[in-house]
Every structure is written in structure tokens, then in C-alpha cells.
Interface confidence: medium
């Protein structure tokens, strides 16, 4: 699985579907302090 900063950030921001594609949804997480570059 992708474990770079961007991957983790995007997962936490609710941007990714199971296939890894970008999806638009209504999930708004709290800022749990995800990641960097």
C-alpha cells in the first residue's frame, strides 16, 4: 500500500476510493494532523 505523506493525507482527507482513484464525497474529517509534502 502507498504510505507516502501524500497518500496518507489524501486518505485522511477522504479523497480516495478503494481503487485509489480520486472521488468527490461529503466526508469532512477533522484535521487529525496528517502529513507533509
Amino acid at each position: 500500500a502507498c504510505d507516502t505523506a501524500t497518500c496518507v493525507t489524501h486518505r485522511l482527507a477522504g479523497l480516495l476510493s478503494r481503487s485509489g482513484g480520486v472521488v468527490k464525497n461529503n466526508f469532512v474529517p477533522t484535521n487529525v494532523g496528517s502529513k507533509a509534502f
Epitope: T4, T6, T9, A13, L15, L16, V22, F27, P29, S34
Partner: antibody
Framework: EVQLVESGGGLVQPGGSLRLSCAAS????????ISWVRQAPGKGLEWVAE??????????HYAEAVKGRFTISRDNAKNSLYLQMNSLRAEDTAVYYC?????????????WGQGTLVTVSS | EIVLTQSPATLSLSPGERATLSCKAS??????VSWYQQKPGQAPRLLIY???NRYLGIPARFSGSGSGTDFTLTISSLEPEDFAVYYC?????????FGQGTKLEIK
Amino acid sequence: EVQLVESGGGLVQPGGSLRLSCAASGFTFSNYWISWVRQAPGKGLEWVAEIRSESDASATHYAEAVKGRFTISRDNAKNSLYLQMNSLRAEDTAVYYCAVYFDYGLAIQNYWGQGTLVTVSS
Amino acid sequence: EIVLTQSPATLSLSPGERATLSCKASKRVTTYVSWYQQKPGQAPRLLIYGASNRYLGIPARFSGSGSGTDFTLTISSLEPEDFAVYYCSQSYNYPYTFGQGTKLEIK
């Protein structure tokens, strides 16, 4: 307002050392992963190193070109990121940027500092 | 290491025209591609992340597409301030890598 301010650049001889700093403000520094990216004069962008958050044990990753010579570190109490550069080579001459990338709700945030120039020359 | 190849190296167009910039990855990177704009003496500015998501405050004339290994940045109608160097980057695998850049210049 998020701000990243790099310092510590300058002229150094081949084989010498230099320590860069990046002072962060406007966000909870300890929570975020942060990177150094460099750009040689007139050239493209090159990722250098990344350090993870305090909760991720400040784990690090490096580009192959700097592995064993450069060390990325952070001082969360000072909201500061560092890059210790040893055994410097002419090809390390570049503007060094610190950059942070994180989520805030559904909005991705990306910030870069203004850069600090490192010149390795005899 | 994943190599990103951008084309063309230089693109000469006039304001109002459409610009199409290409970025090809040597391995599959799903949608973990970003596009940056850089002007002389300035830090890079994020335009597109996740291959197709416009960053905050980026005008609608900028759009990104692609997945897997082939990615495209399109500027639908060039404004004078769009002439700059554009870089794609991948953050699917370490080390993060950037393309060599496409210089968009005024014809």
C-alpha cells in the same frame, strides 16, 4: 497564516558542512510531515528528504543522492526543521526549500518557504 | 525510482490559446500526481493534486486528468500570467520525483 522561513544557506567548500533551518508558524508543527526540496540553478526540482510527525516517531526518508550525507531532524518545541548537510559536493549547490502538505477538512494545504541558497565551491 | 517524463520541453503559445502539457510515469502511480507552476525567483505553487483536483484558489482554466502512467495538465485559455515553468510530480513511491519541467513561453 502558515509560514515557512528557511535560513542557514551560504558558500561552503567541497567536503564541508552546513546546517539549514526552517522556522514554521501558523500550524501545529509537531503533527505534520515535512520535506526538503532543492533546485539547482537553472534546473528542475528534486526532493531531498522527509521527516514524519512526532506521533510517527519522526521517521525519515531520503533521496539516494544524499543518503548517508544529509540528516533531516526536527525540534517540535521550537517549531523548527533542520537539514544537516555533510560531505558537500558541487552538485549539492541549489536553493533549498522546506515544504509542508497536509489536509484540513476536505481542503488540501500546501506551503513552501522562500528558499535558501547553498553554494558549494572552492 | 519512478521517472516522470514531461513533454514538450518548451511550448510556445499566445494568450487565449489552449495549452496541453503531458507527463508520463515509468511505473503506475495511480492518481498520485501533482502539477506545480514556478515563476523565476519564486517557490513552486501547487495547481493540481490527486491528478485532477484543483488546489485552493486556482482558476478553473487549469485542469488535470489521467491515471496510471499518463497525465495531462490543460490550460483552457492562456492568460499572460500563465507563462511559466510547469512541473509534474509523483508521491506514490519514495523517492518522490519530479518531471524535468515544461517551459510555457509567449509566442
